[in-house]
């Protein structure tokens, strides 16, 4: 079965600064990927970022430099400390469209005790969803 | 068909606050950002701030912070934005237009809202 | 915050000739520029996004180029409905306008 790991990580240099990683574990190829805040698109989420294969990458502020890490994970910067930018209990989602298995979706958040700098290393999340 | 209705043109006296309206169809009106735009007479464009309808979420060009407040009606489909203490540096066409995502940015605009301040 | 110069002003042509108009960023938007043009009345019209990704229903005489800080648009083949005024939008992050550049028919 498919699944989505999501780790959030708080920048030591930069308290509000976070630093959010995504990434597919299946065996399909992806068309896109959508990563939102604030809960799962279409559940009260506001989109962060769309990242297609061949049509680009769109981001919205205060989601910074949006890109690729592999064929099957990206990664985005979150920066910013104004009425619009996230905070430590921030939840975080990200949306996988691939062929053959469908959208796969999962969430994450900061760790309750992390330290600046600090992640717990990428594991599936919890929230998993498949349409 | 992707369609933005705007409010028509309205004349307030100075001090007053007005409100414009922006009508969605044509499209899922929660999954994608509504901006505004503002142009000044014999003047270019200048973009205000934008709302995700989807979760409320908005962010405000630094030069608008207090002047315009933008919300939604999910129900109806519907953005407003409300303009405060308005002064005759307010009176200008006022566009929404909706950021298509990686169709582009601002790919549907409203026909625009004409707004005068004058006592 | 992102500055958007876009040049000429205005400029006049001949109908069936070419036209450029440039935007100059003050840093690297990457190629995240869109192109527009305006008619008073009508709300503005997308042209171009990324560069040069002409909109499905924009005809292949309106084309854009560049990358980094500096980008052009060019119309060839000029016919009466292009009269209008036209602006770059970079929205690399957050949006900034050009200065918009009004043509005429000569």
């Known amino acids: 079965t498919p699944e989505v790991w999501v780790q959030v990580r708080m920048e030591a240099t930069e308290l509000s600064s976070f630093t959010i990683r995504c990434g597919f574990l299946g065996s399909g190829s992806i068309s896109l990927v959508t990563v939102s805040w604030g809960g799962p698109n279409g559940a009260g989420g506001t989109t962060l970022a769309v990242l297609h294969p061949e049509r680009g990458i769109r981001q919205w502020a205060p989601a910074r430099q949006a890109r690729w890490e592999t064929q099957s994970s990206i990664s985005l910067i979150l920066e910013g400390s104004g009425a619009s930018s996230p905070c430590a209990n921030t939840t975080f989602c990200c949306k996988f469209a691939s062929f053959p298995e469908g959208s796969w979706e999962a969430c994450g958040s900061l760790p309750p005790s992390s330290d600046p700098g600090l992640s717990a290393p990428p594991t599936p999340a919890p929230i998993l969803r498949a349409d | 068909q992707v369609h933005l209705q705007q409010s028509g043109p309205d004349l307030v006296k100075p001090g007053v606050s007005v409100k414009i309206s922006c009508k969605a169809s044509?499209?899922?009106?929660?999954?994608?950002?509504i901006n505004w735009v503002k142009q000044r007479p014999g003047q270019g464009l200048e973009w205000i701030g934008w709302?995700?309808?989807?979760?409320?979420?908005?962010y405000y060009n630094e030069k608008f912070k207090g002047k315009a407040t933008l919300t939604v009606d999910k129900s109806s489909s519907t953005a407003y934005m409300l303009l405060s203490s308005l002064t005759s540096e307010d009176s200008a066409v006022y566009f929404c237009?909706?950021?298509?995502?990686?169709?582009?940015?601002?790919?549907?605009w409203g026909q625009g809202t004409t707004l005068t301040v004058s006592s | 915050d992102i500055q958007m110069t876009q040049s000429p002003s205005s400029l006049s042509a001949s109908l069936g000739g070419k036209v450029t108009i440039t935007c100059k960023a003050n840093q690297d938007i990457n190629k995240y520029i869109a192109w527009y043009q305006y008619k008073p009345g009508k709300g503005p019209r997308l042209l171009i996004h990324y560069t040069s990704t002409l909109q499905p229903d924009i005809p292949s005489r309106f084309s854009g180029s560049g990358s980094g800080r500096d980008f052009s648009f060019s119309i060839s083949n000029l016919e009466p409905e292009d009269i209008a005024t036209y602006y770059c939008?970079?929205?690399?992050?957050?949006?900034?306008f050009g200065g918009g550049t009004k043509l005429e028919i000569k």
């Open positions: 044509g499209y899922t009106f929660t999954d994608y950002y």
């Open positions: 709302i995700f309808p989807g979760s409320g979420t908005t």
């Open positions: 237009a909706r950021d298509g995502g990686l169709r582009g940015p601002f790919d549907y």
């Open positions: 939008l970079q929205y690399d992050y957050l949006y900034t």
